[in-house]
Structures are given as C-alpha cells and as structure tokens.
Interface confidence: low
C-alpha cells in the first residue's frame, strides 16, 4: 500500500497580532484510521493545541468540516493571534489503539506575529547640563515582531549620529524591545530644540511612530552679568544696575551685598522670554555715597538653577563724585566676573 | 493632546449595573493596553486588570472576576467598565489608565489617567 | 501578591525642603517600579517609570532611586505646588500592586 503522507504545505505563515492565521494540512490517504492532532514545539515538551476528539480549545477551528466522510483536510485556524502563539505547528496522525500510537508528522509550519511598536517613549538626562556638554537620551519601544526594526534620532529635522542601539532578546522570541542611547552636544541656542526618536517597522505600513523630549528640559544657559553706574543724582545717590542675561531657566535668585554684607535678595519671576527662550532681567540698587567716608565694594550675586553662586564685584569711588558728575559709566570693576564654568 | 475622557458621575442601587466609559483621544486606542483601577473613599489605588486593545483580551486582577466586564468599542475610541449586581463595597471613583508600553515588556506603569468616575451604590 | 510598603505613611515639610519618600516592595521586582502623585479630589499623574525615568513634562526636582525592593522619590525644593499624596507601584509581577501612599502636607 502507498505510504501516508501528511502535507503541510507552508512553511511559514506570518500574521498580524489580532488576526486569524490558517495552518493547512492535509493526508494522502484515509488509512490507517485514527485521528489528527496538531500540537505546538516537538518532542516531549510540545503543546497540544487542538484535539478533534476532546479537549476545549475556544481559539482554534477547523477550516472543513472533519466529521465528514472521507475529509482529508485537517487545516485549523487559530483566532485572535497574540505574539505568544508564535512557534512552530505540527499536524501529526495518529494510529487507532489503546493508546493511539504516533504514525507520521507534517514538515511543521512556522507561524510569526507581526505585532506593532509601542509608541516611543523619549527620557532626558535625571540633572540639567550646560552648553558645549554632552547630554543622552534614551528612547524605548517595546512589543513588535519581527525582530527587523529601524529607528532614527533626529534634533530640530537634523539626524543625529552619536547614537546606540540595543534590540532585545538577541535570539528568538515572541516578540522584541529596543532601546536606543543619543549624545547631544548642546548649544546656547537649545532651549526651544526638540529630539525625536523615529521607529519604523512593517506592521506600521510605512507611518514611523514618533517620541520627543525638548531640550528645554535638558539645558541650563547661565546667565551673563554687567554692572554699570548711572549718574549720580542731586541726593547725592548713585544709581548701580546688574543686567543678568541669556539665562535659562528661570529660577534664579539675586543678591546686593554692600562691603560684603547683604542688602537685598531677588527672586526672579513672571520674566518675559527672549526669542531663543531665554530670559533677562535687570535689578538696580541706589546707594547714598555722602553715607559713606570710604569706598563702596559692591556685589552683585547670582545664583541660577541651584548652581554656585556667580559674582561681579566693582567699588564706587566715594571721592570721585562730584555733584556733576557725567553721564552713564560703567562700574569701576575691582572684581573678576567669577561665572563658573559648569 | 492626549486624553482619557471618562463619563460622568452615576449613582444606583444595589443590584443594579452600571457602565463607565472611557475615551482615548489624541492616540490610537488599540495601540496601548488601557487599565482600570478603583478607589474606594478615603483609601489608595486598586488594580481592577487591564484590557489588550489590539486583541481585545482582558485581564482581571483576583477580585474582580465574575461581576466586572471591560469591554471595546474601536469605533469610537473607548474602553468600558461594566459593573453588574452592584453593592455598597462598590461605592468608589473608578480611573481607566493607559499602559506606557505595548504587550506588556515596561507595559505596567501608567502615563495617562481618566479623571475617574464616582459610582455611588445605595439604597 | 507582592506588597508594597511606603515610609513615612504621612510627611510635614515646608516649601524649599528637600523631601525624601521610600518604598519597599516585599520581593524583587527588579526596577518595574512607577510614582503617581494624587491631589484630592483628582487623578493621580504619572511621575517616574521603571524606578528612575521621569515623564516628560515633570518637572527636573523630582527624581527616582533603587531597584530590587528599595526604591526611593525625592523632591529636591519643595514648591507648593507639591504637596500631595504620593504613591508607588510594581508592575514587575501580576496583580499590579499600589502602597497606600504617603501624604505630604505643609508644615
């Protein structure tokens, strides 16, 4: 008698998460009598996935109806595909006995899920940075099968080439995760810059799923600092201004201090911003020079962002003021501009 | 913008049922799993389960098996919660909360929260 | 289930403090960990995921510590804006598991 052969003829299937996938198989002979059964992996540990006879397997159907006389398609389809269903199908035949005795097995059909990334999620650096610093970003997607995905950093449409990517497991698996690490040098012009993480795959039909973080979150621009001195006024008082510039963010908290002792504090707030997102603010302090027999070393102090202190010293020259004295001047600076380098 | 826009306050008596919707603006309901989570009074934050939006499948913590029903409808972008055979231990403002990742990997932790629905239960 | 121990269960601090809140998770949950804060009255809003990530658009004075079963939230400068209920969870593990949460009140 001919040989019995059970045919599978796919060798893989490939499906969408969600979808139906059909596993056909057929038999080229109604002899020996005994059932089908498909099971999922070979050997010992491999899983029963549907039984003819007994079991309940809510999921999975037959395609005909294999009740019929001579039916010899034993084709399933299996609903509602999850990534975990991904493995390899056997259709195997059985011999009638007690027990049934294994007779032959199909080639086995691979099934693959397609399973969409998750959307990019885009982290900053935990702690601000300066410019001409380099910060990372990381961007994580998760859940998609295959494994082939692409992704692409870009800062303001720009691709950026500082970048490492990671796609996990390295072997087979029901479906992978990727995380990938940019080095972003950042400039003084930042605050209003973004980073977008860029994620392609086949299950996205050519619609790249995106994630962004702003640098804004990522960069601190400490401030600049100028003292200058106007006039002096009939009162004998003199006007002193401290212009803080380009600082970003706002947070920033700014000290007078007479001869080292302290004579105001600001906060500063509600500070309009300049085009490049950065902020200005200006603070000035009168100080009645005929109080005075000796010079006056006034500072000018300057904390940003919780970051040490930046000072500009300079000392108003008590006995250089005449009651006509000129126009604007700037401060007499007996002091370095300490501005820290961060 | 994204959003999980919840229905209103409902107030019933025991035994009734109730269902809470919840609507995904600003992304794509199936792309993420969308939890529920129940607050009782004056206590902390309880896992209801989740629902797998692309599939369809739900999860249900211990608990809320048999009377709890999440459901889909991707047409109009919503997840519901249905209650039935309602108590007075039911009294709590329900939250839909949407999982930050896809299948499950970082899938636990929730970035965008419903602003909750008071279900009242009383005689 | 996994259980989820937060400490101090209740908090007075004053705006500009530097507030340090802690949970403990009664087994391994690697760094599957998630902060909300809840004001009442609302829901909560998501702060960190996976022990140390920060959402975008939360603000840098918060920040995430630890792994395994002890992590940590602090909140470098109190603003008033902060006081809240605080609460932790693992996703490490099914059922998804909250603490009862720490309450942060002004001083």
């Known amino acids: 008698e001919e040989e019995l052969q059970v045919i599978q003829p796919e060798k893989s299937v490939s499906v969408a998460a969600g979808d139906s996938a059909t596993l056909n198989c057929t038999v080229s002979s109604l002899i020996p009598v005994g059932p089908i059964q498909w099971f999922r992996g070979a050997g010992p540990g491999r899983e029963l996935i549907y039984n003819l006879k007994e079991g309940h397997f809510p999921r999975v159907t037959p395609v005909s109806d294999p009740t019929k006389r001579n039916n010899m398609d034993f084709s399933i389809r299996i609903s509602n595909i999850t990534p975990a269903d991904a493995g390899t199908y056997y259709c195997v035949k059985f011999r009638k006995g007690s027990p049934d005795v294994e007779l032959k097995s199909g080639a086995g059909t691979e099934l693959s899920v397609r399973a969409k990334p998750s959307a990019p999620v885009v982290s900053g650096p935990a702690v601000r940075a300066t410019a001409e610093h380099t910060v990372s970003f990381t961007c994580e997607s998760h859940g998609f099968s295959p494994r082939d995905i692409t992704l692409k950093w870009f800062k303001n449409g720009n691709e950026l080439s500082d970048v490492q990517t990671n796609v996990d497991p390295a072997g087979k698996s029901v479906s992978y995760s990727i995380r990938s690490t940019a080095r972003v040098v950042l400039t003084r012009r930042d605050v209003h810059s973004q980073v977008i993480c860029e994620v392609a795959h086949v299950t996205l039909q050519g619609d790249p799923l995106r994630g962004t973080a702003n640098l804004s979150e990522a960069i601190r621009v400490p401030p600049f600092l100028e003292v200058t001195q106007q006039s002096m006024r009939a009162d004998n008082q003199v006007n002193v201004t401290c212009q803080v510039t380009k600082f970003y963010p706002q947070r920033l908290q700014l000290t007078w201090l007479e001869n080292g002792n302290v004579s105001r504090t600001e906060m500063a707030s509600a500070l309009p911003e300049n085009k490049d997102g950065t902020y200005n603010w200006t603070s000035w302090l009168l100080v009645n020079v005929s109080a005075h027999r000796d010079d006056v070393k006034l500072t000018c102090q300057v904390e940003h962002d919780g970051q040490p202190a930046v000072n500009k010293s300079f000392s108003v020259k008590v006995s250089a003021h005449p009651k006509e004295q000129g126009s604007n001047t700037a401060a007499e600076n007996t002091g370095t501009n300490e501005r820290n380098i961060y | 913008q994204i959003q999980l826009v919840q229905s209103g306050s409902e107030l019933k008596k025991p035994g009734a049922s109730v269902k809470v919707s919840c609507r995904a603006r600003?992304?794509?309901?199936?792309?993420?799993?969308m939890n529920w989570v129940r607050q009782a009074p004056g206590q902390g934050l309880e896992w209801m389960g989740f629902?797998?939006?692309?599939?369809?499948?739900?999860t249900y913590a211990q608990g809320f098996k048999g009377r709890f029903v999440f459901s889909l409808d991707t047409s109009v972008s919503t997840a519901y919660l249905q209650i039935g055979s309602l108590k007075a231990e039911d009294t709590a403002v329900y939250y839909c909360?949407?999982?930050?990742?896809?299948?499950?990997?970082?899938?636990?932790?929730?970035?965008?929260w419903g602003q909750g629905t008071l279900v009242t239960v009383s005689s | 289930d996994i259980q989820m121990t937060q400490s101090p269960s209740s908090l007075s601090a004053s705006v500009g403090d530097r507030v340090t809140i802690t949970c403990r998770a009664s087994?391994?949950?690697?760094?599957?960990l998630a902060w909300y804060q809840q004001k009442p009255g609302k829901a909560p809003k998501s702060l960190i995921y996976?022990?140390?990530y920060r959402y975008i658009g939360v603000p840098s004075r918060f920040s995430g510590s630890g792994s395994g079963t002890d992590f940590t939230l602090t909140i470098s400068s109190l603003q008033p804006e902060d006081f809240a209920t605080y609460f932790c969870?693992?996703?490490?593990?099914?059922?998804?598991t909250f603490d009862q949460g720490t309450k942060l009140e002004i001083k």
């Open positions: 909360a949407r999982t930050r990742g896809y299948y499950d990997f970082d899938g636990g932790a929730f970035d965008y």
């Open positions: 600003g992304y794509t309901l199936t792309d993420y799993a």
């Open positions: 629902i797998n939006t692309y599939t369809g499948e739900p």
């Open positions: 087994q391994n949950v690697g760094t599957h």
């Open positions: 996976s022990a140390i």
């Open positions: 969870q693992q996703y490490n593990t099914y059922p998804l």
